[in-house]
Interface confidence: medium
């Protein structure tokens, strides 16, 4: 709805959910269905985003805010505002141009998205492998023989997994 109009710019007082209709003496007209204006002073309302196909509606469009989409089961969001949906893979796999492929030996992926990452190299920290890695899990590093003095910790957690370069938000 229109508020008291400014003498300088009548459009500045049109609130969210309306547009300043130049064809009608700069009156604040409500946004038509399937359109919105999220800020005041708009000269037009924007068309609502439609969540079709692999996208599904997470939040309906209203007169003041756009619809928000996410992805149907088996897919996950990529990009700002879920601009793309990417196919899920199983743990122990990564998505390639030819579809989901098992992680190569020496790499793992513990998520349904992202890329396979190399197992932690325990020896770089002077540790030994306590539990072997798999396609789905990183190795668990244990103490080196020199660490086996009384009171020493017997297990250190694996290095934190790095986020893949194209991980979703």
């Amino acid at each position: 709805f229109e508020r008291t109009r400014s003498l300088q710019d009548p459009c500045s007082n049109c609130p969210a959910g309306t547009f300043c209709d130049n064809n009608r003496n700069q009156i604040c007209s409500p946004c038509p269905p399937n359109s919105f204006s999220s800020a005041g002073g708009q000269r037009t309302c924007d068309i609502c985003r439609q969540c079709k196909g692999v996208f599904r509606t997470r939040k309906e469009c209203s007169s003041t805010s756009n619809a928000e989409c996410d992805c149907t089961p088996g897919f996950h969001c990529l990009g700002a505002g879920c601009s793309m949906c990417e196919q899920d893979c199983k743990q122990g796999q990564e998505l390639t141009k030819k579809g989901c492929k098992d992680c190569c030996f020496g790499t793992f992926n513990d998520q349904k998205r992202g890329i396979c990452r190399p197992w932690t190299n325990c020896s770089l920290d002077g540790k030994s492998v306590l539990v072997n890695g798999t396609k789905e899990r990183d190795v668990v590093c244990g103490p080196s023989p020199a660490d086996l003095s009384p009171g020493a910790s017997s297990v250190t957690p694996p290095a934190p997994a790095r986020e893949p370069g194209h991980s979703p938000q």
Epitope: F1, P15, P30, P32, P33
Partner: antibody, heavy 116, light 107 residues
């Protein structure tokens, strides 16, 4: 589901004040403005004004400037209507209504009776 | 302020009848008109917005039409649940104004 639940009926004496509450649930309170509508006994609907639930800024219809105040407590998703210096002619049912492309959901109404 | 004039003010009809209520605006309000139904002692319910779009859950027997200054609410086959008062409202500009109401009663 969207629900607006208003406070119960009030019986007040002329000159007193009353505060009517409207508790919203089932949606994000600050995404939609809240409007207030009055209906006197046996009469039609009269728009009183609205409040921007994001900024708290109220807008009042000409006939409701002065003694009528809209306010919010966003922490409990509640809008309020306060009427001061009550008069007999304020006797009416007061409704809150969420606004999207129209007043799409309404509270059940609060009857305010002003009588000496 | 924009005046919304509804007619008739009272309408007697029977179950199964086709009912038409009209609303005239004192000036052009584009398609920014809504229709509400109110039963005795209850809050109004939105039926139609933007002149012709049914609100969620509203039965298809309710339809709206018109633009500019003349608007119509039609109930194609009146049901027992439809005996109520109906209001039009322009929401083109502030203040949004309601029509005086049309009471649909049993003949």
């Amino acid at each position: 589901q969207v629900q607006l639940v208003q406070s119960g009926s009030e019986l007040k004496k002329p000159g007193a004040s009353v505060k009517v509450s409207c508790k919203a649930s089932g949606y994000t309170f600050t995404d939609y403005s809240m409007h207030w509508v009055r209906q006197a006994p046996g009469q039609g609907l009269e728009w009183m004004g609205w409040i921007n639930t994001e900024t708290g800024e109220p807008t009042y219809a000409d006939d409701f400037k002065g003694r009528f105040v809209f306010s919010l407590d966003t922490s409990v998703s509640t809008a309020y209507l306060q009427i001061s210096s009550l008069k007999a002619e304020d006797t009416a049912v007061y409704y809150c209504a969420r606004y999207d492309y129209a007043m799409d959901y309404w509270g059940q109404g609060t009857l305010v009776t002003v009588s000496s | 302020d924009i005046q919304m004039t509804q007619s008739p003010s009272t309408l007697s009809a029977s179950v199964g009848d086709r009912v038409t209520i009209t609303c005239k605006a004192s000036q052009d309000v584009s398609s920014a008109v809504a229709w509400y139904q109110q039963k005795s002692g209850k809050a109004p319910k939105l039926l139609i917005y933007w002149a012709s779009i049914r609100h969620t859950g509203v039965p298809s027997r309710f339809s709206g039409s018109g633009s500019g200054t003349e608007f119509t609410l039609t109930i194609s086959s009146l049901q027992p649940d439809d005996f109520a008062t109906y209001y039009c409202q322009q929401r083109y500009t502030t203040p949004p104004t309601f029509g005086g109401g049309t009471k649909v009663e049993i003949k």
